[in-house]
């Protein structure tokens, strides 16, 4: 199987744009756009803090923690209204991700 230039292998993703805003103290806001080529039944998501193809049902039900979006050893919790998730590091630092 040969891929054309710029074509992604099925089941993989790449980051297209990544914008960071560090203007607020102790807070960095990052927005990223990703491109994925997913198998049937999958959709672009986040696994282990990186873009990945995930089960489409996860997105449909907004059970974000089922994507395993946090790094190993971090705890995942859904935000109120399932608008995203938080990853809590062992030291207590919390990273919040909202889905738009």
């Amino acid at each position: 199987q040969f891929l054309k230039e710029g074509q992604l292998a099925a089941g993989t993703c790449e980051i297209v744009t990544l914008d960071r805003d560090s203007s607020q103290p102790r807070r960095t806001i990052a927005r990223q756009t990703v491109k994925c080529s997913c198998f049937p039944g999958q959709i672009a998501g986040t696994t282990r803090a990186r873009p990945a193809c995930v089960d489409a049902r996860i997105i449909k039900t907004k059970q974000w923690c089922d994507m395993l979006p946090c790094l190993e050893g971090e705890g995942c919790d859904l935000l109120i209204n399932r608008s995203g998730w938080t990853c809590t590091q062992p030291g207590g630092r919390i990273k919040t991700t909202t889905v738009s």
Epitope: G11, F39, A52, C65
Partner: antibody, heavy 120, light 107 residues
Framework: QVQLQESGPGLVKPSETLSLTCTVS????????WSWIRQPPGKGLEWIGY???????NYNPSLKSRVTISVDTSKNQFSLNLKSVTAVDTAVYYC??????????????WGQGTTVTVSS | DIQMTQSPSSLSASVGDRITISCRAS??????LNWYQQTPGKAPRLLIY???TLQSGVPSRFSGGGSGTDFSLTITSLQPEDFATYYC?????????FGQGTKLDIK
């Protein structure tokens, strides 16, 4: 390191329900997917299904009408129920951890397996 | 369902030999393929994921290749502990399916 241990009855009567539990030690059950696989005597491996941290499941369509996989995060355990068993369900049953290696989901930690015989 | 077909189903070789096992998927699975090794009475052990990435702790004499529908597992310089049954498994769809296995025994 993470270890898995299957437990449950080794003998089940036909038409009854096979119930097995997998206990996860050395790691959190919430950070992975978890799977059940079986292997009839002298045959190959058959994927039964897996469960997400939330309790959502994916099952093998060939068993879907009879199988239930559930998770108890407080006990760090997940379970398999297979109802209306017959002799063809006689097998070694394995539980396994499903690890998302980047884009590639693979079963990287396995229990030692438990033999279940269906017989009256 | 995606069907996985391994060949050969059995193979005899000697210590020090180089062997290759093939696995074919009934439709394209990109590189979403894993290889497992199983010795009698033991649980399977993950060798390779993503078609070619060696799992941690697996000796470098094992290697995997392929993409799409055709894959291979190669063992260079067979060691006594390598005589076992090998399974390929796709991770691109539900249900996850395994090949029927290739039994490698001593000639």
């Amino acid at each position: 390191q993470v270890q898995l241990q299957e437990s449950g009855p080794g003998l089940v009567k036909p038409s009854e329900t096979l119930s097995l539990t997998c206990t996860v030690s050395g790691g959190s059950i919430s950070s992975y997917y978890w799977s059940w696989i079986r292997q009839p005597p002298g045959k190959g491996l058959e994927w039964i299904g897996y469960i997400y941290p939330s309790g959502s499941t994916n099952y093998n369509p060939s068993l879907k009408s009879r199988v239930t996989i559930s998770v108890d995060t407080s006990k760090n355990q997940f379970s398999l129920n297979l109802k209306s068993v017959t002799a063809v369900d006689t097998a070694v049953y394995y539980c396994a951890r499903v690890n998302p290696f980047g884009y590639y989901y693979a079963m990287d930690v396995w229990g030692q397996g438990t033999t279940v015989t269906v017989s009256s | 369902d995606i069907q996985m077909t391994q060949s050969p189903s059995s193979l005899s070789a000697s210590v020090g030999d180089r062997i290759t096992i093939s696995c074919r998927a009934s439709q394209s699975i990109s590189t979403s393929l894993n290889w497992y090794q199983q010795t009698p009475g033991k649980a399977p052990r993950l060798l390779i994921y993503g078609a070619s990435t060696l799992q941690s702790g697996v000796p470098s004499r094992f290697s995997g290749g392929g993409s799409g529908t055709d894959f291979s597992l190669t063992i260079t310089s067979l060691q006594p502990e390598d005589f076992a049954t090998y399974y390929c498994q796709e991770s691109a769809s539900i249900p996850r399916t395994f090949g029927q296995g290739t039994k490698l025994d001593i000639k």
